[in-house]
């Protein structure tokens, strides 16, 4: 874990992140809430909205076409991961070829998980952990042999399962609600400021 002094207003040492957060005026669509202070570049934010983008060559449509309502949560998840300067309390060192740091157990507000889970109920997948076990031979992820496509709820029976399992426990579902100052919001209205700054401060203090 990082020293106490490096928990606030920091960027992860990962594949596409800036070294330090700074304003980024041209952030695209769903990533635009982070434009006042961002760990992502404008081109990263544009790529976050594309299927099989150069960011990770990840194919959201690995079990047929993902619905737009579902896909927008994965775009938002990417924006949060790439752009947020408020994830410092949950950054961990990791020995991976493509990044030196990751996030672990970020407490996502329960409503953000509920909405994600509900909006993906009619989309399909073949795995519960999307970080590993894919067939990458085509240059993008495909379902491994023997992994059958089922509706999301088959692999993620609850909203908590979706948020915690999909990215190897990068997230966990918080018992707290949006606006409490105790959980990270994947979605927020930039006109009302970034609520995650307060959340990071709270957990940084708690960890010191």
């Amino acid at each position: 874990a990082r020293p106490r002094t490096e928990l606030l207003n920091v960027c992860m040492d990962a594949k596409h992140h800036k070294e330090k957060p700074s304003p980024e005026d041209g952030l695209h669509k769903q990533c635009s809430p982070w434009k006042k202070n961002s760990c992502c570049f404008a081109n990263t934010s544009r790529e976050a909205h594309k299927d099989i983008s150069y960011l990770y060559r990840f194919n959201w449509n690995h079990c047929g076409s993902m619905t737009p309502a579902c896909k927008k949560h994965f775009i938002q998840d990417t924006c949060l991961y790439e752009c947020s300067p408020n994830l410092g309390p949950w950054i961990q060192e990791v020995n991976q070829s493509w990044r030196k740091e990751r996030i672990l157990h970020v407490p996502l507000c329960k409503e953000d998980c509920e909405q994600w889970w509900q909006d993906c109920r009619t989309s399909y997948t073949c795995k519960s952990n999307w970080h590993k076990g894919w067939n990458w031979t085509s240059g993008y992820n495909q379902c491994p042999e023997g992994a059958a496509c089922h509706p999301f709820h088959f692999y993620f029976p609850t909203s908590a399962a979706l948020c915690s399992e999909i990215w190897s426990h990068s997230y966990k579902v918080s018992n707290y609600s949006r606006g409490s100052g105790r959980c990270i919001q994947m979605w927020f209205d930039p006109a009302q400021g970034n609520p995650n700054e307060e959340v990071a401060r709270f957990y940084a203090r708690a960890m010191s």
């Epitope: 669509k29 635009s32 927008k72 938002q76 409503e111 606006g179 979605w187 927020f188 209205d189 006109a191």
Partner: nanobody, 132 residues
Framework: QVQLVESGGGSVQAGGSLRLSCAAS????????MGWFRQAPGKEREGVAG?????????????YYADSVKGRFTISQDNARNTVYLQMNSLKPEDTAMYYC????????????????????WGQGTQVTVSS
């Protein structure tokens, strides 16, 4: 001053459909969460469906439903008319209640859209009666 006016209620046989409308006027905010709630005699007010209007930064609107109405009810909006609709299909006798529309400038999603305490403006309600 915010005014919410519901319409479209009535009596229908089980299995039938109704479409409720909620017309909002005087709302000073562009981005609004709106919810449909219902209250049967002797029961607490419960959230049925909610919608957040959003914008570019949300990839469009967000909707959320109570488990009891999922797949039967659909909430939608007409921004030009400042109106939110609740299309109710496959109605059941247990859907009988007074239906209320509510609004708030908060960005609500998930179960937050179904929480009455999150809303600060309410309509007068429209009665829905489903007979078997």
């Amino acid at each position: 001053q915010v005014q919410l006016v519901e319409s479209g209620g009535g009596s229908v046989q089980a299995g039938g459909s109704l479409r409720l409308s909620c017309a909002a006027s005087g709302y000073p905010y562009h981005r609004v969460s709106m919810g449909w709630f219902r209250q049967a005699p002797g029961k607490e007010r419960e959230g049925v469906a909610g919608i957040y209007t959003g914008g570019l930064y949300t990839g469009g609107s967000m909707t959320y439903y109570a488990d009891s109405v999922k797949g039967r009810f659909t909430i939608s909006q007409d921004n030009a008319r400042n109106t939110v609709y609740l299309q109710m299909n496959s109605l059941k006798p247990e859907d009988t209640a007074m239906y209320y529309c509510a609004a708030t400038p908060q960005f609500l999603i998930g179960s937050g859209l179904l929480r009455p305490d999150k809303y600060n403006s309410w309509g007068q309600g429209t009665q829905v009666t489903v007979s078997s």
